[in-house]
Interface confidence: low
């Protein structure tokens, strides 16, 4: 099924997929490494490449593909194929082709964009694949009612790649390559170098050949009462080699088992047609996280996280040129810092501090799916103005030669900011408004043996309003 | 022919400076991101910094960073490397090398220039 | 920096031999790895990129697979032009960083 305007009816429901508000000439860059990007553009052409073109490379802005608004559905995933590129320079009689993959992945996450899986050399082909709520047509639940509880395995999502698990009755012990990639109420995110069909969620590799869907997800998990399991059901359109009659199946029991390990599924059995995984995990077992002071116990890993050795000084980081002073159970800065007398995070401007969050609001959590310690402080310092569209000011700023800290009236009737660093070479503004939120701050630890306290860095910010640091360090990794 | 040609090696004193220039030849030089990749005698091959194909991103090995500068001019199609603070541990062959466009690496190598830094 | 451990350091071989070579990346990096030739007093020449693409003008007999973090070159028969230093390389991740190098010698 295809349309001609970035947008596709998936025939069977109805539903109207529209991606057209992934549009827009700037585009997204997807990387095919480091210092490797391709931008890209959605359904039209990319500013930054040559006109009618796509993508092209970022280094040279070779054209991969020509702009084209026609998508199409197949089994839960859309594609949108850019052809007729710049000559490929390995095959002169091919040109470059780009094939773009959506599916559905219900939250945005640091992955919601392009990501290359893979290239074909032989075709000139480059396969990108993005994960989107975009391309969901209803949220997948990943609960089940357990009486009055739920049990919510969305901690076992793999938010990268998939786990791998391997058939043990085969003979070849020699062989280390995965069996089987799978993920769980959501598709197997894009694995370079693995190229499972996208929109599958167990993904059989056979020695001879590509890797195979041999599971999507069809809904919810589901209990059983009587065998007290949680059990999770997929279903391909894969016809099933031993049996052309026959589509390829896959179920995944959940046992409860506690521990810190979160497990990993292990095939059970297989009739050729059907696959039956097993998964221990402490994730069906009752959860409870209990704080006292600087520690967070998780009682489905019967562990504690013990963060009291970080407590004992402050920390410093700075991005671009602004610098956050980071308690850890303990205030920010000290006295001498206007502003953040309580503040757990505190932004450093000259004698003056924005409190990211007060000392007092601390909580402390543990996150499965992420193998995580969270620190998180709120209601700190007023958030800085926006402008009335909603885009942050930036400051300071430079303006006619002078910088500026706050929102200004010269030259104007009303208070204004400058939406980037220099509004002399910009000239991007905006009216000020005032918002009605405080600063607030996270700051998720997670293990890393080859760091012994270790120091955070910051993971993102959000118009001046919140910041998340990541620190890796030994202190939060289990026995 | 793709060609690169290093120059401005020389001898050094510690704490001095000099400044290397890669000339390129017989390819689109503005459209491929370059390379300083350095070794020492008898040693292997130590990358030293990268600079993207309009010099708006670039890239240094911890050992140089703050020392070593790599720019471009598109124009003259010529790399280049100013090299401050120089100590013993820089005497080395430094090669100017072109990045592969599609898929990485380092796919055009200089001959090399020779920096010895010596009291 | 991710490091680029390479084995063996040097191997003697003779002529008509197959040859691997073998390097190991600290961390997962894809397939971003390149294999390099360098000859005395000679500029490194590339071999080798995204880990098993050979360039062209290299003859087949040189080859490379492996991803993640374990790689292999393979020359499948030895030739007297072949003795010479091999690098890797990864290029995953700035600073890009090299392998310590094998000298493959006549024996």
């Known amino acids: 099924n295809t349309h001609d305007d970035c947008q596709v009816t998936n025939p069977s429901t109805g539903h109207l997929f529209d991606l057209s508000s992934l549009s827009g000439r700037a585009g997204i860059n997807a990387s095919y490494s480091e210092k490797g990007l391709v931008f890209m553009s959605i359904c039209e052409e990319n500013e930054n490449c040559g006109p009618g073109v796509g993508a092209c490379f970022g280094q040279t802005r070779i054209s991969v593909g020509k702009a084209s608004k026609r998508l199409s559905y197949k089994d839960q995933v859309l594609q949108l194929v850019y052809e007729n590129g710049s000559p490929c320079p390995s095959l002169s009689d091919l040109r470059y082709k780009s094939v773009i993959s959506f599916v559905c992945r219900p939250e945005a996450g640091p992955t919601n964009r392009p990501m290359l899986i893979s290239l074909d050399k032989q075709t000139c082909t480059l396969f990108f694949s993005w994960h989107t709520p975009l391309a969901c047509e209803q949220a997948t639940e990943c609960t089940v009612r357990n009486g009055s509880s739920i049990i919510d395995l969305s901690p076992l999502i793999h938010r990268t790649g998939g786990y791998e698990a391997y058939d043990e009755s085969e003979d070849d012990t020699s062989d280390t390559t995965p069996d089987f990639y799978i993920n769980i109420c959501q598709p197997l995110n894009p694995m370079h170098g693995v190229p499972c069909p996208a929109g599958a969620s167990v993904c059989k590799v056979p020695v001879d050949g590509p890797p195979i869907d041999i599971g999507r997800v069809t809904g919810p998990p589901i209990f059983n009462p009587v065998a007290n399991e949680v059990y999770l059901n997929f279903e391909s359109s894969t016809h099933c080699l031993a049996d052309r009659y026959m589509n390829y199946t896959s179920l995944i029991t959940f046992h409860c088992k506690r521990g810190v390990s979160m497990g990993t599924p292990k095939l059970i059995r297989t009739n050729d047609c059907d696959f039956v995984f097993e998964w221990e995990t402490p994730i069906v077992c009752p959860d409870e996280v209990k704080t006292q002071g600087c520690a967070v116990t998780d009682e489905q890993l019967l562990y504690s996280f013990n963060l009291t050795s970080l407590s004992t000084s402050t920390f410093k980081v700075t991005r671009d040129a602004r610098t956050y002073s980071i308690g850890v159970c303990t205030a920010a800065a000290g006295l001498g810092q206007e502003g953040c007398k309580d503040g757990g995070v505190c932004l450093l401007s000259g004698n003056k501090g924005a409190s990211f969050g007060r000392l007092a609001s601390m909580q402390l959590d543990y996150r499965h799916q992420d193998e995580a310690v969270i620190l998180s402080y709120v209601n700190g310092d007023p958030c800085p103005p926006e402008t009335d569209d909603g885009e942050p000011c930036v400051f300071p700023f430079i303006y006619k030669g002078k910088s500026y800290d706050e929102c200004v009236l010269e030259g104007r009737a009303k208070l204004w900011c400058s939406k980037t660093a220099n509004y002399d070479r910009d000239h991007e503004w905006g009216f000020c408004r005032q918002t009605n939120s405080y600063r607030m701050s996270a700051i998720i630890f997670t293990c890393d043996e080859s760091e012994d306290i270790g120091r955070p860095q910051v993971f993102s910010e959000d118009r001046g309003c919140e910041v998340t640091f990541e620190w890796k360090t030994k202190v939060v990794c289990p026995p | 022919e793709v060609q690169l040609v290093e120059s401005g090696g020389g001898v050094v004193q510690p704490g001095g400076s000099l400044r290397l220039s890669c000339a390129a030849s017989g390819f689109t030089f503005s459209s491929y991101a370059m390379h300083w990749v350095r070794q020492a005698p008898g040693k292997g091959l130590e990358w030293v910094a990268v600079i993207s194909y309009d010099g708006s991103n670039k890239y240094y090995a911890d050992s140089v960073k703050g020392r070593f500068t790599i720019s471009r001019d598109n124009s003259k199609n010529t790399l280049y490397l100013q090299m401050n603070s120089l100590r013993a541990e820089d005497t080395a062959v430094y090669y100017c090398?072109?990045?592969?466009?599609?898929?990485?690496?380092?796919?055009?190598w200089g001959q090399g220039t020779t920096v010895t830094v010596s009291s | 920096a991710i490091r680029m451990t390479q084995s063996p350091s040097s191997l003697s071989a003779s002529v008509g031999d197959r040859v691997t070579i073998t390097c190991r990346a600290s961390q997962d990096i894809s397939s971003w790895l390149a294999w390099y030739q360098q000859k005395p007093d000679k500029a490194p020449k590339s071999l080798i990129y995204?880990?098993?693409s050979l360039e062209d003008g290299v003859p087949s007999r040189f080859s490379g697979s492996g991803s993640g973090t374990d790689f292999t070159l393979t020359i499948s028969s030895l030739q007297a032009e072949d003795f010479a230093t091999y690098y890797c390389q990864q290029y995953n991740t700035y600073p890009w960083t090299f392998g310590q190098g094998t000298k493959v010698e006549i024996k």
């Open positions: 090398a072109r990045d592969d466009r599609f898929f990485g690496g380092m796919d055009v």
């Open positions: 995204a880990a098993s």
